[in-house]
Amino acid sequence: EVPQLTDLSFVDITDSSIGLRWTPLNSSTIIGYRITVVAAGEGIPIFEDFVDSSVGYYTVTGLEPGIDYDISVITLINGGESAPTTLTQQT
C-alpha cells in the first residue's frame, strides 16, 4: 500500500493563491507528489503539477477569488499512487 500524507495543511491564503505544506514521507520508494486542484463541483482538475519527493511546500497560483477549491496531494511511487489527501479551501 502506497503511504498517504497525513499532515497536509494550508498556509498563506490570498484571493488568488493557496500555499500547501506537508512533511515529506521518509521512504526511498516515493518518487514525488501529484498536486491537483478542482473547483468544487467540477469534474476534472483545473490545475495539476508534480513535485519531487523531497518537497514539502507548494503554492498554487492563478486561482479565482471566492471559489471553493478541493486540493489534493497524492504520493507517487513507480507503478502506483496513494489515495489522495484532500482539503477544501475558499480563496
Epitope: 468544487a40 467540477e42 495539476e48 492563478g62
Partner: antibody
Amino acid sequence: QVQLVESGGGLVQPGGSLRLSCAASGFTFSSYGMHWVRQAPGKGLEWVSVISSSGSYIYYADSVKGRFTISRDNSKNTLYLQMNSLRAEDTAVYYCARNKVGFDVWGQGTLVTVSS
Amino acid sequence: DIALTQPASVSGSPGQSITISCTGTSSDGGGYNTVSWYQQHPGKAPKLMIYYVHKRPSGVSNRFSGSKSGNTASLTISGLQAEDEADYYCQSWDLLAPSVVFGGGTKLTVLG
C-alpha cells in the same frame, strides 16, 4: 491574444474516420484541461469529451464512448479528437474549449459532415 | 443522470429585464453548484457570460447576472439591448459520470 483554432473537419462517409486538431496560442496550454463540444445544425450544444492538463483524467459522453479518442500534445500546444466509426448523427460543428471554471475560451469551430 | 431544462424561448423589449431559468433534475453528485451560462449568436462560437452561478468574467457587461435557488439557476439580463438577441445555454457537471451537461438552450428575442 488567447486563441483556439480548430482544423481537420470535412466530409466523410458513414463508418469513416477523421482527426480534428485544436491549436492553442496566447496561454500556457499545458496548464489547462480542454474540452470538445459539438453542435448539430440547428441544434443545441452537446459536450463530447474532456482531457485534464496532464492527460491523467479523460471522460467521454456516452454517445461517443468507444468511437472517439481525445488526446493532447503539450509540447505542440495542440488538442486532438480522433473520430472513428462515424455516423450521420455525428454531423456537427466541433468546438474546442478551455476548461477554467466554466469554458472561458472557445475556438471558431470546424464542420464535420458524415454523409454518403 | 442530470438533465438541465431551459425554456425554448423568451422575449422582451429594449430596456426591460428578462430572466432565463435552468432547472436541474435528478442526482448530479454536487456539480450543479458550478452552473455557467453561455451566449451564442448565429454562426458564432459560444461566449462565457456567467460562471460559478453568479460570477462574471472580465469584459462581460454588468447587465448580466446569475443566481440560483434550490435546483433552479437563473440568468437575468437587465436593460435589454438589441445585441442581446441570441441563444443562451446553461451548463453544469454531472459528477457521477463524470460528464458535462448543457441545457437545451433558450432563444432570446428582443422585440421592436
